[in-house]
């Protein structure tokens, strides 16, 4: 499987769109910052088989998509940017799905790293809980936007490492 330059371009576009989505100054939200305990070890990419790493990346994209496609999210962000963001994420998920199939074969079930997938899910649960507790305030969304950009950067770095392995 070759995570192509196109995929890399999608990653950059996703981050660019997230940057453009900002609506308020993050400096008015310093007190709202929160440690969501990003599962960084799951993105170090050394201990994984390639299929497992791709599965973790796919879960990251899926959870990001879920988070930003809620009713509360639609109210918080610019609709046009959000639509473009969905398209980029959807494209990345498709690329990753194709890669998983290629890596493990159509007939086989991917050797999923269940613990890693669960760690990503729990990470997003913490984010969702934070947003609920903060009543989906503009600052809460701004903190989450910065957090997701940071985690997408980790995803991008893992994908770069996977490409180098090809």
């Amino acid at each position: 499987c070759n995570l192509s330059q196109t995929h890399s371009l999608n990653n950059r576009r996703t981050l660019m769109l997230m940057a453009q989505m900002r609506r308020i100054s993050p400096f008015s939200c310093l007190k709202d910052r929160h440690d969501f305990e990003f599962p960084q070890e799951e993105f170090d990419g050394n201990q994984f088989q390639k299929a497992q790493a791709i599965s973790v990346l796919h879960e990251m994209m899926q959870q990001t998509f879920n988070l930003f496609s809620t009713k509360n999210s639609s109210a918080a962000w610019d609709e046009t940017l959000l639509e473009k963001f969905y398209i980029e994420l959807f494209q990345q998920m498709n690329d990753l799905e194709a890669c998983v199939i290629q890596e493990v074969g159509v007939e086989e079930t991917p050797l999923m790293n269940e613990d890693s997938i669960l760690a990503v899910k729990k990470y997003f649960q913490r984010i969702t809980l934070y947003l609920m507790e903060k009543k989906y305030s503009p600052c809460a969304w701004e903190v989450v936007r910065a957090e997701i950009m940071r985690s997408l950067s980790f995803s991008t770095n893992l994908q770069k490492r996977l490409r180098r392995k090809d």
Epitope: R12, L15, A19, L30, H34, E37, A146, R150
Partner: antibody
Framework: QVQLQESGTVLARPGASVKMSCKAS????????MHWVKQRPGQGLEWIGV????????TYNQKFKDKAKLTAVTSANTAYMELSSLTNEDSAVYFC?????????????WGQGTTVTVSS | DIVLTQSPASLAVSLGQRATISCRAS??????????MHWYQQKPGQTPKLLIY???NLESGVPARFSGSGSGTDFTLNIHPVEEEDAATYYC?????????FGSGTKLEIK
């Protein structure tokens, strides 16, 4: 690779204004906040303020609110800082620095610094 | 403004020994799990270099002999074992609230 190229040494008279530049390369200029930091000879570092080149948003240290003006021209990948009503206290090295890790607000890449000397 | 007090102002440490630099904030710079304190190294005639972010996270490419610890108002930078190339001035910086401020610096000399 990431580079921040600052303008050269400036000699200015008290009361005058100076505008220094910081040309960025090797990364997406519009999506990273750019900080400016002051260092007086043999002294520590002072945070002046920060600009988001993507839309020109700025946040200043109140101490420098009437002293410094931060701007950016995205087509030139360049950030600028203008210092007005110069006094001897403004003689210093001024660094532009790229924001790092989003809302952690650390600084990873630094320009080489612009030396401003105020003298009559 | 949050004042960061660094101590000592200067110290001389023998090669291979431990250097400990302290940074005390006039107000807590920790919130919800993160401590917004960072450490930089500046060698004479050079620009500052980020060593540690969020109190204890080693920046990529920085040798593991550098470590940071602390939370709330009290933070420490440790260098062990000290090497010749570590001779520099070290600054702490907080990003807990506006304005961000730096400590006054600690000059490390290698004996």
């Amino acid at each position: 690779q990431v580079q921040l190229q600052e303008s050269g040494t400036v000699l200015a008279r008290p009361g005058a204004s100076v505008k220094m530049s910081c040309k960025a390369s090797g990364y997406s200029f519009t999506t990273y906040w750019m900080h400016w930091v002051k260092q007086r000879p043999g002294q520590g570092l002072e945070w002046i303020g920060v600009i988001y080149p993507g839309n020109g948003d700025t946040t200043y240290n109140q101490k420098f609110k009437d002293k410094a003006k931060l701007t950016a021209v995205t087509s030139a990948n360049t950030a600028y800082m203008e210092l007005s009503s110069l006094t001897n206290e403004d003689s210093a090295v001024y660094f532009c620095t790229r924001n790092y890790k989003y809302d952690y607000y650390t600084m990873d890449y630094w320009g080489q610094g612009t030396t401003v000397t105020v003298s009559s | 403004d949050i004042v960061l007090t660094q101590s000592p102002a200067s110290l001389a440490v023998s090669l291979g020994q431990r250097a400990t630099i302290s940074c005390r904030a006039s107000k807590s710079v920790s919130t919800s799990g993160h401590s917004y304190m960072h450490w930089y190294q500046q060698k004479p005639g050079q620009t500052p270099k980020l060593l540690i972010y969020l109190a204890s996270n080693l920046e990529s490419g920085v040798p593991a002999r550098f470590s940071g610890s602390g939370s709330g108002t009290d933070f420490t930078l440790n260098i062990h074992p000290v090497e010749e190339e570590d001779a520099a001035t070290y600054y702490c910086q907080h990003s807990g609230e506006l304005p961000f401020t730096f400590g006054s610096g600690t000059k490390l000399e290698i004996k």
